[in-house]
Interface confidence: medium
């Protein structure tokens, strides 16, 4: 319409480049139960892996250990405010628990996916310095290094995470009976410019939780892989068999990561572009209506990697059915191993004792002969 | 074309009922919530009540609490005012309208009302002895 | 409830003068508020929500502004056909409450 132009034939309707935006219908109990399944798996699945990490001596506990721990940490953290937000979801989006739970659990949701993000960034660093760098790097792999690195990788998560602990509130928008919990600019920003601080922290959580890190991990595998495949090329017939595990489980895991996060990133960014680009009204209704279902997934990732990190290794599986028996007969002693030694750790790196090519104290030898054969990745 | 047509309205006396319709089209009728505003003849505007796209949730101000039921038919695409224990003070044009939110895309549950964007022509109602 | 009050209650002006109303609230209602353009005999119009979002449709000359408990509407350059009544509407809270309106009239 031009300036100065009469209106009054105009009916107040938004034009067509305005979406007929309506309220989330919730899956009714499809999304509360995955969030209760997922706290329950998550729960015994992480639980499971502190047990098994911690209950090692620390003389045979190795660098990835430390990431494996602070993974589980970081997603029992999280798993255990999931049945406050089944609860929230359930109750059609009514939070009973009051402000302090909606800023510690929505703190803890972030806290998890930078901590997680970087320690599975660790552990593929540690794993490229493992198999394609064993002797230049192997002193940065030491315990005190992985202790050093765990310090910054959590500090940094509970300061990136910290915008949410202070922006999420809860209140009664409408003077309605309903309470909800959720991201209140007011504080920070002005009106106008609450949608730029919104995608600003959208944009930099994607970038800081996602993009970088999954950069890196892609990294470390593609030079992973390219190490192995070398080394196999000059092996007999049957290395191919652990080649091809090997390589596979490290596609696993780095699928399995993207899968769970790709789509929460994706559609988050798709989203806020849509004020750039304005995506067709069907769309974006679409983004904000698959959205929720995008979290739920990122949200199950923190009882998958228990089972993607600790149940490949043998050792694991080792460590959990001599805590099954041990807790049905109390195993007529202490538990033992095959091999004859105590129960190891669960190292997503290493491999528990001093092995062929082992120094002192199980650390690598500076001798690159089979510097993955100690990976507990292959699995025999 | 969007549009609101209200109709039901007329004279009635003090203690009577009347029940205005407002029939929407050019629409997704289903999608919107939708509100009832008066206007007494030459005063201000005051919102009456409004209810949720499935009529889960209904509001209203406290004058009319107990007397006025609002209610929809999205099949028929039509919004319903029922009055009852009419009073003289409840003279006035009704108006039917779209209400109109913005959602929250990271916090589902909340929304932020924007007021309402379609307004009806209006029905006159005259509670008189 | 929250009260909304207007000032002027009317005002006479000139074409292409401009013209600013207020609106203030009796509690902090954030940028929960919208302004409505009615004419005698017609239905109310949404110029802006949301304080300062200017409807689709509307000509760029109204503007809205304020924020917590004052709030302007600001018409730059008044035209013959925005001789009216102005009302604002909060919609932080339930009951939603019009201002009593400004009537602006021509000098």
């Known amino acids: 319409m031009e300036e100065g132009g009469d209106f009054d034939n105009y009916y107040g309707a938004d034009n067509q480049s305005e979406c007929e935006y309506t309220d989330w219908k919730s899956s009714g109990a499809l999304i509360p139960a995955i969030y209760m399944l997922v706290f329950l798996l998550g729960t015994t699945g992480n639980g499971l892996v502190l047990w098994t990490v911690f209950r090692s001596s620390r003389e045979k506990r190795r660098s990835a250990d430390i990431f494996i721990a602070s993974l589980a940490v970081a997603d029992l953290t999280f798993v255990v405010t999931l049945p406050l937000w089944a609860t929230y979801t359930y109750r059609d989006y009514d939070w009973p628990f009051g402000t302090f739970f909606c800023k510690l659990s929505s703190y803890l949701i972030f806290v998890n996916m930078y901590a997680s993000v970087f320690c599975l960034t660790g552990l593929s660093f540690d794993r490229y310095l493992a198999i394609v760098r064993p002797v230049a790097n192997a002193r940065l792999r030491l315990r005190v290094s992985g202790a050093v690195a765990t310090a910054v990788l959590w500090v940094l998560a509970a300061l990136l995470a910290m915008p949410v602990m202070v922006l999420r509130t809860t209140g009664d928008l409408e003077n309605t009976t309903k309470v909800q919990c959720y991201m209140d600019y007011s504080m920070v920003a002005t009106v106008s410019s609450e949608w730029a601080w919104e995608v600003g922290l959208g944009v930099s959580s994607t970038t800081v939780g996602f993009v970088v890190p999954f950069t890196i991990m892609l990294t470390c595998y593609f030079f992973i892989a390219q190490t192995i495949a070398g080394h196999f090329r000059k092996e007999r017939i049957e290395g191919l068999r652990k080649r091809r595990r090997l390589l596979s489980i490290i596609v696993v895991l780095v699928v399995t990561f993207a899968l769970c996060w790709m789509p929460y990133h994706l559609v988050k960014t798709l989203y806020m572009l849509g004020s750039l680009l304005h995506w067709p009204c069907d769309f974006d209704l679409f983004l904000m209506n698959i959205f929720p279902y995008c979290t739920c997934i990122s949200y199950v990732n923190s009882c998958l990697n228990p089972f993607l990190y600790a149940f490949f290794d043998p050792r694991f599986r080792q460590a959990c059915t001599s805590m099954l028996c041990c807790g049905q007969s109390r195993c007529a002693g202490t538990s033992h191993s095959s091999s004859g030694e105590k129960s190891a750790s669960y190292s997503s790196g290493h491999s528990q004792g001093p092995g062929p090519n082992m120094g002192k104290g199980g650390e690598q030898m500076h001798e690159k002969s089979i510097p993955y054969s100690q990976e507990t990745l292959v699995v025999d | 074309e969007v549009q609101l047509v209200e109709s039901g309205g007329g004279l009635v006396q003090p203690g009577g009922s009347l029940r205005l319709s407002c029939a929407a089209s050019g629409f997704t009728f289903s999608s919107f919530w939708m509100s009832w505003v008066r206007q007494v003849p030459g005063k201000g505007l005051e919102w009456v009540a409004n209810?949720?796209?499935?009529?889960?949730?209904?509001y209203s101000v406290d004058s009319v609490k107990g007397r006025f039921t609002i209610s929809r038919d999205n099949a028929k695409n039509s919004l319903y005012l029922q009055m009852n224990s009419l009073r003289a003070e409840d003279t006035a044009v009704y108006y039917c309208?779209?209400?109109?939110?913005?959602?929250?895309?990271?916090?589902?549950?909340?929304?932020?009302?924007?007021?309402?964007?379609?307004w009806g022509q209006g029905t006159t109602v005259t509670v008189s002895s | 409830d929250i009260q909304m009050t207007q000032s002027p209650s009317s005002l006479s002006v000139s074409v292409g003068d401009r013209v600013t109303i207020t609106c203030r609230a009796s509690q902090g209602i954030r940028n929960d508020l919208g302004w409505y353009q009615q004419k005698p005999g017609k239905a109310p119009k949404r110029l802006i929500y949301?304080?300062?979002s200017l409807q689709s449709g509307v000509p760029s000359r109204f503007s809205g502004s304020g924020s917590g408990t004052e709030f302007t509407l600001t018409i730059s350059g008044l035209q013959p056909e925005d001789f009216a009544t102005y009302y604002c509407?909060?919609?932080?809270?339930?009951?939603?409450?019009f201002g009593q309106g400004t009537k602006v009239e021509i000098k």
């Open positions: 209810i949720k796209q499935d009529g889960s949730e209904k």
């Open positions: 509407l909060q919609h932080n809270s339930y009951p939603r409450t």
């Open positions: 949301a304080t300062s």
């Open positions: 309208a779209r209400d109109r939110f913005g959602y929250s895309f990271y916090d589902k549950g909340v929304r932020y009302y924007y007021g309402m964007d379609v």
